[in-house]
């Protein structure tokens, strides 16, 4: 994020390199445009937050499925 700006609660330094099991993912949010890079944050059943690359096809697929549900 630009110095001096206040990003929202979470940004991502980088992205996971593995595809999460579909049934592990229960929710998601997109990080703010104030963050230095775009990211999708998946919430897992265990309450973990996982940073993912929004340009990856599996990430787009999971987001689509979560929106449907």
């Amino acid at each position: 994020a630009p110095m001096g700006s206040d990003p929202p609660t979470a940004c991502c330094f980088s992205y996971t390199a593995r595809k999460l099991p579909h049934n592990f993912v229960v929710d998601y949010y997109e990080t703010s445009s104030l963050c230095s890079q775009p990211a999708v944050v998946f919430q897992t059943k265990r309450g973990k937050q996982v940073c993912a690359d929004p340009s990856e096809s599996w990430v787009q697929e999971y987001v689509y499925d979560l929106e449907l549900n």
Epitope: M3, S5, T9, S14, A17
Partner: antibody
Framework: QVQLKESGPGLVAPSQSLSITCTVS????????IHWVRQPPGKGLEWLGV???????NYNSALMSRLNISKDNSKSQVFLKMNSLQTDDTAMYYC??????????????WGQGTSVTVSS | QAVVTQESALTTSPGETVTLTCRSN?????????ANWVQEKPDHLFTGLIG???NRAPGVPARFSGSLIGDKAALTITGAQTEDEAIYFC?????????FGGGTKLTVLG
């Protein structure tokens, strides 16, 4: 449980290179970054760099020309290589786990460190 | 490269509240610096306490809290315990790299 363990040569001659391995367990390198940090005797911490799950790296700009960080996900190992060592590179060298999200502690679990002495 | 400054040493007593601070020479510390606090205990035992300015790591006692106070990051220990005697390092993120402060040696008399 989460564990990180550094292994290194102990003694390095001036102008030679340093190679340290960080072996991790209890988590996957595909889901976390690994930071390298050093502490000269009696001094504070200096961040050296980080390797992210996809293999991308960030480095301390003052040391970038001498540093290389790489990894082998299948062996759960991360490697630090530093060239052209001088006596002021004498330090304890640590690896630390790096979560990807900014709302978590960015170096949450640390290894016990490996001592490196640069001397002829 | 940025320089991050901490008090070199502080002394407190059990039960007292003590605040350690972390200043950047580039200007005010903001939430974009994702201030972290790391504790060093004897025998090179490091533990991450606080991340993202004010988020406690799992298992870290509630007496440890992080915040921004004025133009600095701060670590407050509310009701210090003798086991809190340690060296505390802050670390600030500058777009693509971390910089550590010099550390604060906290003595808890008692």
């Amino acid at each position: 449980q989460v564990q990180l363990k550094e292994s290194g040569p102990g003694l390095v001659a001036p102008s030679q290179s340093l190679s340290i391995t960080c072996t991790v367990s209890g988590f996957s390198l595909t889901g976390y970054g690994i930071h390298w940090v050093r502490q000269p005797p009696g001094k504070g911490l200096e961040w050296l760099g980080v390797i992210w799950p996809g293999g991308g790296t960030n480095y301390n700009s003052a040391l970038m020309s001498r540093l290389n960080i790489s990894k082998d996900n299948s062996k759960s190992q991360v490697f630090l290589k530093m060239n052209s060592l001088q006596t002021d590179d004498t330090a304890m060298y640590y690896c630390a786990r790096g979560p990807l999200i900014t709302t978590e502690v960015s170096m949450d679990y640390w290894g016990q460190g490996t001592s490196v002495t640069v001397s002829s | 490269q940025a320089v991050v400054t901490q008090e070199s040493a502080l002394t407190t007593s059990p039960g007292e509240t003590v605040t350690l601070t972390c200043r950047s020479n580039t200007g005010a510390v903001t939430t974009s610096n994702y201030a972290n606090w790391v504790q060093e205990k004897p025998d090179h035992l490091f533990t991450g306490l606080i991340g993202g300015t004010n988020n406690r790591a799992p298992g870290v006692p509630a007496r440890f809290s992080g915040s921004l106070i004025g133009d600095k990051a701060a670590l407050t220990i509310t009701g210090a315990q003798t086991e809190d005697e340690a060296i505390y390092f802050c670390a600030l993120w500058y777009s693509n790299h971390w910089v550590f402060g010099g550390g604060t040696k906290l003595t808890v008399l008692g």
